[in-house]
């Protein structure tokens, strides 16, 4: 509900500054609050436009301030108006000269239909003139000069709504400037009644609250709150939830509070007088000090709050036993909440006694919409209301208000909600590579639409035309490999970005489709690669028996290790070998093979081989003679790769003997790099030569090596390493 309050400070204008302040408490008006002159109430008042400014001390408040030199232009009737969701509330008030000839008993007077009413003005200046009384600027009554009493009265024995209006009194020779004003508010219904036909019964509006004739709700005086105005506010506070505060040194002194009709204007609790600058006499409290304390157990009477009950007692007169009421307090509600658009379940938690019920807790959106709890629970000390907004959107950002209204009072806590747009990638992910059971994906998570920061990223994928749920993997890098996919299957892919906070999963981005490769046949078995000539290699394999009717062939890929030369050869599936020709002599080649149908098969392991050499082999290198004994010695060597070396020959003879007396040892395994010579003579010098042989011929040794055996019984010398042929 709208809580609009007009503070008139001061209604009696002298030479001091005077003002009107209009406050929209606890809600945000859709249109600006307006303050204007009320020509309905007083037609012939000053026409000057008002200088309305923002009240810097409050968020939603407007103010008009008149400096002392403007005093002559102030007299008249004013209004403040606020609107929210089509509903308008207008509050009226008046200002008059303190030096007027008459002064009203009260600024406003609220009566019920049918009441016996006396509107009274006190004579302040004595003049030899007739007194005149006007209603809404029109003459209604005069009193001859000799009969003007100290209290000038308009008597309405049976007040009707049409009697309502601004009544003014002055001497006939005066003018608006010397007039006194009072406003009569006549409730459309008789006492305790409300409704369009006035046949419903009001709840009790305590502490001089007034029952609204249209809704049956109580309008509570400044300083009291709750459904029946039973609860006193904290000292010097006012408003429907008591969250507005009087900033003066003496609290709300000199503040006349005007509320929507039928309330009218009054002082805050604890003050009385036309200027609200007189404190209540002992034993009295409330607005205009009209309420009398009748505290049951002799408790103290506070002029602001009434009876201050002893522990264990409650009620206006401390007449009821029970736990004293405690104004509700809203707890654990942060000032600022960041929310992701979508479903939102705000929580409002409150303490107090009695504990607030679910009917007493509401949430007000920035546009004024009132939400009621979807769920509710309470512990010994707290009530927790859970609200549900099925789809909160960025326009819902702004000040929300948690409101709690119990018999013990009302409290509101505004908090700011910032609604974030969920992130969504602008581009579909890209497929970099695929196989029959994997795909390499660039997720293309940026750029994205919506709000960051991005907390995590998900790659979603599923086969097309399958009624399967989307599978997902969490990804940290932009490049990701999807494994365990089905072969020859069309998949769709998209990326979902997640921002911080509950419900931070954005909508998946654009979809990319791709198809995995068909599963391949296994590679040929028994693969063997051998050199055939200087320019050919021969690749052989076992016969292939395919499991399906599909045509197949063998694909052979060969590439040179030394050069960037690659060739792929297709071989009919019924063959078991292929001659790789047009090769370069003395070159190493890497070969692999696979069996292809419509789908490509799996590659075999790499096989390597050298073509036969076109030159004599180089001499073995690093020849060492070691481990010499009286009858043996170990010879080791290394050979260079790539010369098709097929064997090594070791030739030795006793030094000085004829050439034809040598012994040749032929080692046909070219991978062996060590040999032990045995059966040598002790203390004998030998000449040792070593050759490498290939398809062209033998290497030419540049020099011979000498070996001298040891005498018998001496320990061997020099241990060698490497492969040894014994």
């Amino acid at each position: 509900a709208m809580d609009l309050i007009l503070i008139n400070s001061l209604p009696l204008v002298s030479d001091a500054e005077t003002s009107l302040t209009c406050i929209a408490s606890g809600w945000r008006p859709h249109e600006p609050i307006t303050i204007g002159r009320d020509f309905e109430a007083l037609m012939n008042q000053h026409q000057d436009p008002l200088e309305v400014t923002q009240d810097v001390t409050r968020e939603w408040a407007k103010k008009v301030v008149w400096k002392r030199e403007k005093a002559s232009k102030i007299n008249g009737a004013y209004f403040c108006e606020g609107r929210v969701r089509g509903e308008a509330i207008r509050i009226r008030t008046m200002k008059m000269r303190q030096q007027a000839s008459f002064l009203p008993a009260t600024l406003t007077m609220t009566v019920d239909k049918g009441d016996n009413v006396n509107i009274s003005f006190k004579k302040v200046l004595i003049k030899e003139e007739d007194a005149v009384i006007y209603k809404n600027g029109s003459f209604i009554h005069s009193v001859p000069r000799h009969e003007v009493p100290d209290i000038l009265e308009v008597h309405l024995p049976h007040a009707q709504p049409q009697d309502a209006g601004v009544y003014s009194a002055r001497y006939i020779g005066g003018n608006l400037f010397t007039s006194a004003f009072t406003r009569l508010i006549v409730r459309r219904c008789e006492a305790q009644k409300w409704g369009p036909e006035c046949n419903h019964l009001c709840t009790a509006c305590m502490n001089n609250g007034v029952c609204h004739e249209d809704t049956g709700e109580c309008i509570c005086p400044p300083g009291f709150m709750g459904r029946t105005c039973e609860k006193a506010c904290e000292l010097h506070t006012f408003g429907r939830t008591c969250k507005e505060r009087c900033s003066g040194q003496e609290g709300c002194k000199s503040y006349v509070f005007c509320l929507p009709d039928p309330y009218g204007c009054s002082c805050a609790t604890g003050w009385k007088g036309l200027q609200c600058n007189e404190a209540c006499h002992p034993g009295f409290y409330g607005p205009d000090c009209k309420l009398r304390c009748s505290c049951n157990n002799g408790e103290m009477c506070d002029r602001f709050q009434g009876c201050l009950c002893s522990p264990g007692w409650q009620g206006l007169q401390c007449e009821r036993e029970g736990i004293p009421r405690m104004t509700p307090k809203i707890v654990d509600l942060p000032d600022h909440i960041e929310v992701n658009s979508g479903k939102f379940n705000p929580i409002c938690k409150a303490s107090g006694w009695p504990l607030p019920t679910n009917e007493e807790m509401t949430l007000v959106k920035p546009d004024g919409t009132v939400l009621h709890p979807k769920d509710f629970n309470h512990t010994d000390h707290f009530s927790v209301a859970i609200f549900t907004i099925h789809r909160i959107l960025p326009p819902d950002s702004g000040v929300w208000v948690c409101s709690v209204n119990t018999v013990a009072g009302m409290v509101e806590k505004p908090f700011n909600i910032s609604v974030k747009v969920l992130p969504k990638p602008l581009n579909a992910p890209n497929v970099i590579d695929t196989g029959h059971n994997f795909a390499v994906i660039n997720i293309s998570s940026e750029p994205y639409f919506g709000d960051g920061p991005i907390k995590s990223k998900k790659l979603l994928y599923k086969p097309v035309n399958h009624y399967e749920a989307w599978q997902h993997i969490q990804v940290t890098n932009e490049i990701v490999t999807l494994n365990y996919l089905e072969p020859r299957t069309e998949y769709e892919l998209c990326v979902q970005l997640v921002r911080r906070g509950e419900g931070g999963e954005g909508h998946p981005g654009p979809v990319r489709r791709f198809t995995t490769a068909s599963i391949g046949l296994p590679p040929p078995r028994g693969l063997n690669l051998l050199p055939k000539s200087q320019t050919t290699l021969n690749l052989t394999w076992q016969p292939i028996f395919p499991s399906s009717e599909d045509d197949f062939y063998v694909e052979v890929e060969r590439r040179s290790v030394q050069k960037s030369d690659q060739q792929n050869i297709k071989v009919p599936g019924n063959l078991t070998s292929v001659l790789l020709n047009n090769l370069h002599p003395r070159e190493q080649y890497v070969v692999r093979a696979r069996v292809n149908t419509k789908a490509q098969g799996e590659w075999s392991e790499d096989l390597t081989a050298w073509t036969l050499s076109d030159i004599l082999p180089p001499q073995p290198e690093n020849i060492k003679i070691s481990n010499i004994t009286h009858s043996s010695a170990v010879i080791s060597w290394t050979i260079l790769d790539g010369y098709s070396i097929s064997s090594i020959t070791i030739r030795y003879k006793v030094q000085g003997k004829n050439e034809d007396q040598h012994v040749d040892v032929k080692i046909k395994n070219a991978t062996i790099t060590q040999y032990q010579l045995k059966g040598l003579e002790p203390e004998t010098a030998y000449q040792v030569d070593i050759f490498a042989e290939n398809n062209i011929g033998s290497s030419n040794p540049a020099f011979s090596h000498e070996l001298v055996t040891l005498p018998e019984s001496q320990a061997p010398a020099d241990l060698g390493g490497g492969k040894m042929l014994l």
Epitope: E197, E217, R227
Partner: antibody, heavy 117, light 113 residues
């Protein structure tokens, strides 16, 4: 938590009297007007009577006027409905209720009155 | 007295579907001074007292799920349940409080199809 607990139902012969009670807790009873409504078996709801917060004003449905009396004891947080000269058409579940404006917000659990010879 | 007439008397709707209950008053319950409709809606489940759902024709009572909504003005009003749930099976009543005595509609029984 506001609660209205009803008592006093039963079977009664036509022409006889019965008194229904409604005990209120969790609210300042003396601040609220109170209502009685009823519901005949298998039928809809019918408003019966209302009493103002101070007991000064009372209104009745035409069907019960002159036979039923609504009253309250604010010191005991108690609402009563004295039903005299009962008729068979008064057979119903009777509810006490607190208003929210003109709607009835909190209802008692209901008490069954059967008027039968 | 203002007469309230509901239609239909009973209604069967599938779970998740929309349910609509109408209420007509014999005279307008719209008060022009404040543009408010003095109409309430209640839900009553077997063996329980009625439960206030709506007042001022369209203001949801605390704790009432937002699938319930009220609309209409003057003499013709509608209670809508946007997506029927199993727990919504009940009898629904409209009530005017424009004028005393307050009067109720005869009720609409809502069941699941």
């Amino acid at each position: 938590q506001v609660q209205l607990v009803q008592s006093g139902g039963g079977v009664v012969q036509p022409g006889r009297s019965l008194r229904l009670s409604c005990a209120a807790s969790g609210l300042t009873f003396s601040n609220y007007a109170m209502h009685w409504a009823r519901q005949a078996p298998g039928k809809g709801l019918e408003w019966v009577a209302v009493i103002s917060y101070d007991g000064e004003n009372k209104y009745y449905a035409d069907s019960v006027k002159g036979r039923f009396t609504i009253s309250r004891d604010n010191s005991k947080n108690m609402l009563q409905l004295q039903m005299n000269r009962l008729r068979s058409e008064d057979t119903a579940v009777y509810y006490c209720a607190t208003p929210k404006g003109g709607a009835l917000e909190i209802w008692g659990q209901g008490t069954v009155i059967t008027v039968s010879s | 007295d203002i007469q309230m007439t509901q239609s239909p008397d009973s209604l069967a709707v599938s779970l998740g579907e929309r349910a609509t209950i109408n209420c007509k008053s014999s005279q307008s319950v719209l008060y022009s001074s404040n543009n408010k409709n003095y109409l309430a809606w209640y839900q009553q489940k077997p063996g329980q007292p009625p439960n206030l759902l709506m007042y001022w024709a369209s203001t949801r009572e605390s704790g009432v799920p937002d699938r319930f909504s009220g609309s209409g003005s003057g003499t013709d009003f509608t209670l809508t349940i946007s997506s029927l749930q199993a727990e919504d099976v009940a009898v629904y009543y409209c009530q005017q409080y424009y004028s005393a005595p307050i009067t109720f509609g005869q009720g609409t029984r809502l069941e699941i199809k």
